[in-house]
C-alpha cells in the first residue's frame, strides 16, 4: 500500500521501479499540467512529506529511451 | 567480491509456511536494495519481491502479494523471504539477488529449492 | 506487465556455426539485456544494455535491436556456449524475463 519514500529509500525505490528510463525528482515542466505557471510538483513532496503509492512513483520515471539499433 | 548464500529451502505441503534467508557477504549490504527472483524446474525466471536498503519500503510480483514478505536485518547482512500460505505454483528455486543501476540483476546466490506438495 | 517472447525455444549448433537468438517484447522498450544459464548453476548476466558484454564474455557474442525487437548473437559457436540464454528488460514495471532459448552443441 501506499507509503512514505524518504532520502535513499527513495532512490531505490526509483531505481527500481524505472530502471533502464531512470528518473526525474521534479515532473517536467508542464507534465500533467495544463498551465504553464503551474508549481513544480516534486517527489519529495509526493513521496517524503505525504504518503506514495506505486503508480505515483512511476509518474516520475523518465519516458522511454528511443534506442538506437547496435 | 560479493557473496550470496540462500539457505531455508525444503519439502511442504500446500497451505504452509516456510522461511528463506540470504547471507550477504563482500559489500555494504546496508547500502543496496534486494530482491528475490525464482525459477520454477525446468522454466525461466520470475522477479518474485523487492526491499529498499533500509527496509521501509517492499514491492511485490501480483501472485504472491498478500503471502509473501520480505524483510532484511542490516546488522546480520541477512535478507528473508517469509512464504505463508504456499502453493504447488510457488515450487521453484528461489535465487537472493542486488544490482547496481543498469547492471541489473548482477549478482546472484546460488539458490535454494522449494518443493510445495502433498 | 511486457511479456518477452523468446524464440527459438530449443536449438543446436555445430562448432563454427553462427547463432542468433530473439527476444521480442509486447511493447517497445529501451534496451535488452541477456543472461546465460547453465545446468545447476545460477544466471550470469552476459549482456547489458543492448549490446554492452559483462565481464569475461567472449567478443564471439554481440547483443542488437531496439523498440520490440532484439537479438543476441554468436558469431561462431563453441563448445562451452551451450547453455540456455534469457532476455530481460527493465524499462517497465515490473521486471520480466524471457522463457528461455536452450543453445544446445550439435
Known amino acids: 500500500g501506499p507509503e512514505t519514500l524518504c532520502g535513499a529509500e527513495l532512490v531505490d525505490a526509483l531505481q527500481f521501479v524505472c530502471g533502464d528510463r531512470g528518473f526525474y525528482f521534479n515532473k517536467p515542466t508542464g507534465y500533467g499540467s495544463s498551465s504553464r505557471r503551474a508549481p513544480q510538483t516534486g517527489i519529495v513532496d509526493e513521496c517524503c512529506f505525504r504518503s506514495c503509492d506505486l503508480r505515483r512513483l512511476e509518474m516520475y520515471c523518465a519516458p522511454l529511451k528511443p534506442a538506437k539499433s547496435a | 567480491e560479493v557473496h550470496l548464500v540462500e539457505s531455508g529451502g525444503g519439502l511442504v505441503q500446500p497451505g504452509r509456511s516456510l522461511k528463506l534467508s540470504c547471507a550477504a557477504s563482500g559489500f555494504t549490504f546496508s547500502n543496496y536494495y534486494m530482491t528475490w527472483v525464482r525459477q520454477a524446474p525446468t522454466k525461466g525466471l520470475e522477479w518474485v519481491a523487492y526491499?529498499?536498503?533500509?527496509?521501509?519500503?517492499?514491492y511485490y510480483r501480483d501472485s504472491v502479494k498478500g503471502r509473501f514478505t520480505i524483510s532484511r536485518d542490516n546488522a546480520k547482512s541477512t535478507l528473508y523471504l517469509q512464504m505463508d500460505s504456499l502453493r504447488s505454483e510457488d515450487t521453484a528455486t528461489y535465487y537472493c539477488?542486488?544490482?547496481?543501476?543498469?547492471?541489473?540483476?548482477?549478482?546472484w546466490g546460488q539458490g535454494t529449492l522449494v518443493t510445495v506438495s502433498s | 506487465e511486457i511479456v518477452l517472447t523468446q524464440s527459438p525455444t530449443t536449438m543446436a549448433a555445430s562448432p563454427g556455426e553462427k547463432v542468433t537468438i530473439t527476444c521480442r517484447a509486447s511493447?517497445?522498450?529501451?534496451?535488452m539485456h541477456w543472461f546465460q544459464q547453465k545446468s545447476g548453476t545460477s544466471p550470469k548476466p552476459w549482456i547489458y544494455?543492448?549490446?554492452k558484454l559483462a565481464s569475461g564474455v567472449p567478443d564471439r557474442f554481440s547483443g542488437s535491436g531496439s523498440g520490440t525487437s532484439y537479438s543476441l548473437t554468436i558469431s561462431s559457436m563453441e563448445a562451452e556456449d551451450a547453455a540456455t540464454y534469457y532476455c530481460l528488460q527493465r524499462s517497465s514495471y515490473p521486471p520480466t524475463f524471457g522463457a528461455g532459448t536452450k543453445l544446445e552443441l550439435k
Open positions: 511493447s517497445s522498450v529501451s534496451y
Open positions: 526491499i529498499s536498503s533500509g527496509g521501509g519500503s517492499t
Open positions: 544494455g543492448t549490446s
Open positions: 539477488t542486488t544490482e547496481d543501476y543498469g547492471y541489473w540483476f548482477a549478482y
